[in-house]
């Protein structure tokens, strides 16, 4: 997250970290069910671990943390590497979470976002770009949903209805390492960090997010079919 600020503790209990061994964070994810996460399809790895209820980036033990294995990862069948459409994936955890103040699911919004909606994006991704500098703790940033026209103008012929753009002033954006993490609007999960320009936070080049309102049926049916 570029030019965000430290999230208040316990305010993002649905935020998950996807880790490669030993403790390398490579993507964010979101708890949407007691045993299921959503993340970006481009975050798929065969071997990874899931950390929930953790505030700092470092692997130091925190009393609220819960660690999991992913037993199943189900990318949206319409995703096409290295493209950006349908950039979402469900991950089934090896057991159900223990609900606490630090670990709690969030509902996926069934309403599509309108331009001007205020949202919050979070993650442990780099805080500088093109340099790489990772934060000590989870970062939060307020962003506003842009109209689909402004989004298409920013990225001609690259935007479809499975994506939406959001941003703030130049110099504020999500970035590498935030992928798969949540965009929360009005208390519901509206999007996942998907892609954007490089370097991040360039003027008139907003972040692009997976438009989850288009996928509520697929999410529900996939969880039911695999529970």
């Amino acid at each position: 997250i570029i030019n965000g600020s430290d999230c208040d503790m316990h305010t993002q209990p649905w935020q998950a970290a996807l880790l490669l061994r030993p403790n390398q964070l490579y993507c964010g994810a979101v708890l949407v069910h007691p045993q299921w996460l959503l993340t970006a399809a481009h975050c798929r790895k065969k071997v990874f671990r899931v950390r929930l209820g953790h505030y700092s980036l470092s692997p130091v033990y925190e009393s609220g943390q819960q660690m999991f294995q992913g037993v199943k990862s189900i990318p949206h069948p319409g995703y096409s590497h290295p493209g950006h459409s349908n950039d979402l994936m469900l991950i089934k955890l090896n057991r159900r979470i223990r609900p606490t103040k630090d670990v709690r699911p969030i509902n996926v919004s069934s309403h599509c976002p309108s331009a001007g909606t205020k949202c919050l994006v979070s993650g442990w991704g780099t805080t500088k770009s093109p340099q790489v500098h990772f934060p000590k703790v989870l970062q939060c940033l307020n962003i506003s949903v842009l109209s689909q026209k402004r989004c298409e103008d920013a990225y001609p012929r690259q935007i479809d209805d499975t994506m939406f753009c959001a941003g703030d002033k130049a110099g504020r954006d999500s970035c590498q390492g935030d992928s798969g993490g949540p965009v929360v609007c009005n208390g519901s999960l509206q999007g996942l960090v998907s892609w954007g320009d490089y370097p991040c936070a360039r003027p008139n080049r907003p972040g692009v997010y997976t438009n989850l309102c288009k996928f509520t049926k697929w999410i529900q049916e996939t969880i039911q079919a695999n529970s």
Epitope: L20, R21, V47, P77, P82
Partner: antibody, heavy 117, light 110 residues
Amino acid sequence: EVQLQESGPGLVKPSGTLSLTCAVSGFPLSNYAMSWVRQPPGKGLEWIGDIYPSDIIDYASWAKGRVTISQDSSKNQVSLKLSSVTAADTAVYYCARDNNDYGLDIWGQGTLVTVSS
Amino acid sequence: AYDMTQSPSSLSASVGDRVTITCRASQSISSWLAWYQQKPGKAPKLLIYLASTLASGVPSRFSGSGSGTDFTLTISSLQPEDFATYYCQQGYTNSNIINTFGGGTKVEIK
């Protein structure tokens, strides 16, 4: 050097159990998923199953109930057991490492197992 | 079931030819497809993963494309060392799968 080496009896009697081990060197099992694949003489590749560092195991549907895949991280080896074998299980058996992006990037040289009395 | 069907099962070609092998999945596997080359008596070798990403050390005459259900492996200019059997493998799911591999395509000298 990253290497995989399968070993085990080359001949197994019908209705017996085929047991193979895959010795892993040059990387820790804790970081990778491992696969077993077989190839009957003159035929194509058949996936048998995968084992993950967390000991989660996926088996091919034909192998469920007959195959057991396990690993010993302290010895850095993966094992395959196939019970109630018949002549149809005669094949070259390979172990392979997944590159973490769903491609098998390192393979053992394979070991031929013949099922015959 | 996610069945993988390769075509053709064999083909004859000459050095320098452009060769195309196709792999079709019975359901969408998104981009989780790998291609392997196998020579007689040897273990398979990874050529391409994620449908289009070239594995380390693989010559650039090999390329992969496709997503969903239809995939292609192309050898832009066939070399003598490319005569072998090629297999595709899906990595989308392991649930209730008989085989993740396609049946293979043998590339022979014309």
